[in-house]
């Protein structure tokens, strides 16, 4: 018996047909049994093309030129399959090859109708004759499948893939896929705490999936220009209070533990349209609500001599998220949007709730993704369903003590703003937002018998924002901008301009209120230089909850050209602080507003890529950042 394979190496194209030839001669007069076996490569040829073949194999093949590291090895170290066998005129395919166009023809030739990637390897033609057992009964052919397809040829007609072996092609494909995922991963992780990870955790930063689903929905609703119907996971918490001339909106307070503060990371430069939210977590011993309540009480009782009396007498200051930088409190004024939100009950008026909050009952720490179970959401929803009269009892708190006007808040900030300044504090700092610094001596509240606020927030932060002491507050109208037709005119936000006296422009708000009376016909007002995305969305099935974040820049008639300089401003901002402006509401009557936290990344890349938003796209609000 003599078996010969004419071609020792056969090269064929992927998805194309091929024939592996095998000839035999025998002295037997009995019909021979022909079998074709497939043996995979001992070592991946792709590894060789990518320079990954083992040094041992290279050394052995150099020492023994007859030995091929790809073809010569024990069958136990590679895949071995029966492709097909033929006895008489009956051809039987191996299990793995069933359903494929494969047959044995012309004595012992193996025809393969369509080559697949896995077909590369060594094929053995084995002839068995019952009465001729002498001689060579098998021979092999190496089949190499090349990676050119008709599709690829059509797409890349000039790309010569014919010379590219299978493993090179596979290598390039795998490399391409790997690079694609790397790029996706980088982009994803650049914006990890943003809305993209509200639903899927980013593998690079698994603990940073901090924004609840409701935020995203609120953002979409705000963009669309109508109050969102809120459902889903509630935001962390809020302090309801009456904004300056604010429209009705529901407040939200939750007796929920909050995760401990994460170490802030730097944020500098870039566009101002990127949101950066603090990820606030709870201290087991203390409820952050106490801090908020304490500060609000403090503000309500602050130096009456400097207060503006009059039309703002029944308002209290708005409180925003606790920002754990420098153990200082920041305050920012936010733009408002001329649109009404529906009323909803105010938790703050519920004495049962407050007894719970002040009781310091704070439970265990939660992870960064604030998870509230169904029972929590239900109880919260029921607590929201208050009668209007009960809700309005909140006014008692306001009317008893005159509220703080904007000038007074400025003065309040100025009195505490004499602490360390940044070395690079220049006129640009004025545009970096108004941030009040609270002296540590005042940070020991009555509610913290077991520790100071310093302890609560953590000491030793090196980053300090610029002070506001030397600057006054003014309103200045912004240049007119195109806005969506449904947007009501926006007041020019409070600007910090050097050298201005601490005067308050009553006429401005009067005009705003007049316009409010006829919002449909009102002319389109200007807005901030840096409009923003919606900050955050709060609790389940409640009315409209918005997180209000400090704006990046407040410019008094600053030219568009100055935008480039704003990159420097962000240095002055605390990490994760909200950079974006949210649009708020202006309303004729006093009402209560909810407050929530939003969590956002400080990604540089994201900031640079994000296109400037249209002014007036989202709600903003004047808030005191504590």
């Amino acid at each position: 018996l003599q078996v010969t394979v004419p071609d020792k190496k056969k090269v064929a194209m992927l998805f194309q047909p091929t024939v592996l030839r095998c000839h035999f001669s025998t002295s037997s007069h009995q019909p021979a049994v022909v079998q074709w076996k497939f043996k995979s490569y001992c070592q991946d040829r792709m590894g060789e093309s990518l320079g990954m073949s083992s040094p041992r194999a290279q050394a052995l093949s150099k020492r023994n030129l007859e030995w091929d590291p790809y073809l010569d090895c024990l069958d136990s170290r590679r895949t071995v399959r029966v492709v097909a066998s033929k006895q008489g005129s009956t051809v039987t395919l191996g299990d793995f090859y069933r359903g494929r166009e494969i047959t044995i023809v012309h004595d012992a030739d193996l025809q393969i109708g369509k080559l697949m990637w896995g077909d590369s390897g060594l094929y053995y033609c084995i002839i068995t004759t019952p009465d001729d057992l002498e001689g060579k009964n098998e021979d092999s052919v190496e089949l190499l499948v090349l990676g050119r397809t008709g599709l690829l040829a059509d797409l890349l007609p000039s790309f010569a893939v014919e010379i590219m072996p299978e493993w090179v092609f596979v290598g390039l494909v795998i490399l391409g896929i790997f690079l694609f995922f790397v790029l996706v991963g980088i982009c994803w992780c650049q914006c990890c705490p943003h809305s993209c990870c509200c639903y899927v955790r980013c593998p690079c930063c698994p603990d940073s999936c901090c924004c609840p689903q409701a935020l995203y929905e609120a953002g979409k609703a705000a963009k669309a220009g109508y109050p969102p119907s809120v459902s889903g996971v509630p935001g962390p918490y809020s302090i309801p209070s009456v904004p300056l001339g604010g429209a009705p909106s529901s407040g939200m307070l939750m007796d929920k533990p909050h995760p401990p503060p994460l170490a802030p990371s730097d944020s500098t430069g870039g566009s101002h349209s990127v949101r950066k939210g603090y990820r606030i977590q709870a201290d087991k011993e203390r409820d952050s609500m106490k801090v908020l309540y304490y500060v609000e009480k403090e503000l309500a009782q602050f130096d009456p001599a400097r207060r503006m009396r009059g039309r703002y007498n029944n308002t209290i200051s708005e409180l925003s998220s606790l920002h754990d930088d420098d153990s200082n409190f920041r305050q920012s004024y936010h733009q408002m949007r001329n649109k009404q939100f529906p009323m909803s009950g105010d938790l703050e008026s519920n004495p049962d709730y407050w007894s719970g909050v002040m009781g310091g009952n704070s439970g265990t720490n939660r992870g960064p993704a604030l998870e509230y179970n169904k029972e929590d959401r239900e109880s919260f929803r029921h607590s929201q369903q208050r009668s209007k009269s009960e809700m309005l009892s909140r006014k008692n708190f306001a009317t008893g003590v005159p509220a703080v006007s904007m000038d007074e808040l400025a003065a309040f900030a100025d009195s505490y703003g004499q602490r360390s300044r940044r070395a690079n504090g220049n006129s640009h700092e004025a545009r970096a937002g108004s941030r009040f610094e609270r002296s540590e001596s005042r940070a020991h509240g009555a509610f913290y018998q077991d520790g100071s606020l310093d302890e609560y927030y953590g000491r030793g932060r090196s980053r300090e924002p610029p002070g506001d002491g030397e600057r006054g507050w003014t309103y200045s109208p912004a240049p007119a901008r195109r806005r969506p037709p449904e947007d009501a005119p926006l007041p020019r936000l409070v600007s910090r301009t050097p050298g201005t006296a601490p005067k308050y422009d009553h006429s401005y708000l009067s005009s705003v209120l007049e316009r409010q009376a006829r919002p449909e016909s009102s002319s389109r007002g200007g807005s901030l230089e840096t409009p923003s995305k919606l900050g955050a969305q709060l609790g389940p099935r409640s009315a409209s909850y918005y997180a209000w974040s400090p704006p990046t820049t407040y410019k008094a008639g600053a030219s568009e050209g100055e935008d480039e300089d704003d990159a420097a401003d962000e240095d002055a901002l605390p990490p994760y602080s909200e950079l974006e402006l949210s649009r708020g509401e202006l309303s004729r009557g006093p009402s209560y507003r909810g407050r929530d936290l939003s969590f956002h990344s400080n990604s540089e890349k994201r900031r640079k890529k994000e296109p400037a938003k249209k002014p007036g796209d989202f709600p903003t609000r004047m808030s005191l950042v504590v």
Partner: antibody, heavy 121, light 107 residues
């Protein structure tokens, strides 16, 4: 009796299209590769296109690539050749041929009588 | 693609003569070569496959040999019914290809 019968030929203008059919009988059609072979008047045989037994693999002569499409319907025992963008040089007698053995076109043991395609303006 | 060149392109022989037709391949086709006979006005018929194996029903006066690149078809005793065209065809490397043909006539 094993036989192949072609149809669908005719006269067509340059740039036109035609669809040829080949009805097979007398053998297990789905077990064999099939081919179209043409013969221009007074010329030799030219293999045009082939298709594997299940239709998973097709092959074409360079002269017809991109213009002709071979297909088969094993349930109807029929082979097809869709011809588009016909040229004068495509004028020929088109034969349908059964492969001698196996899933790929190699040796043709059964031939049809052919159908004439004339491309003329 | 493998090109096949047949020679002569035409020949005329007497009945009973021994006739030889050659086919040369542009590259090695091993033994994967067929011979066809096409009688006037008819479809081609397979005479020999695998370079030397006679197809069933073909008279034994026909024989063929060769391997690699050079192949020959021999008709030992020419008969009147043998007139027509003879083609070689390779199937070693797809796509299959035909030779130009040899026209055989009877003197």
């Amino acid at each position: 009796e094993v036989q192949l019968v072609e149809s669908g030929g005719g006269v067509v203008q340059p740039g036109g299209s035609l669809r040829l059919s080949c009805a097979a009988s007398g053998f297990t059609f789905s077990s064999y590769a099939m081919s179209w072979v043409r013969q221009a008047p007074g010329k030799g045989l030219e293999w045009v296109s082939g298709i594997s037994s299940s239709g998973g693999s097709t092959q074409y002569a360079d002269s017809v690539k991109g213009r002709f499409t071979v297909s088969r319907d094993n349930s109807k025992n029929t082979l097809y050749l869709q011809m588009k963008s016909l040229r004068a040089e495509d004028t020929a007698l088109y034969y349908c041929a059964k492969d001698f053995v196996g899933v790929l076109p190699d040796a043709f043991d059964i031939w049809g009588q052919g159908t004439m395609v004339t491309v003329s303006s | 693609d493998i090109q096949l060149t047949q020679s002569p392109s035409s020949l005329s022989a007497s009945v009973g003569d021994r006739v030889t037709i050659t086919c040369q391949a542009s590259q090695d086709t091993n033994k994967y070569l067929n011979w066809y006979q096409q009688k006037p006005g008819k479809a081609p018929e397979l005479l020999i496959y695998g370079a030397s194996t006679l197809e069933s029903g073909v008279p034994p006066r026909f024989s063929a040999s060769g391997s690699g690149t050079d192949f020959t078809l021999t008709i030992n005793s020419l008969q009147p019914e043998d007139i027509g065209r003879y083609y070689c065809q390779q199937y070693h490397i797809p796509p299959p290809s035909f030779g130009g043909g040899t026209k055989l006539e009877i003197k």
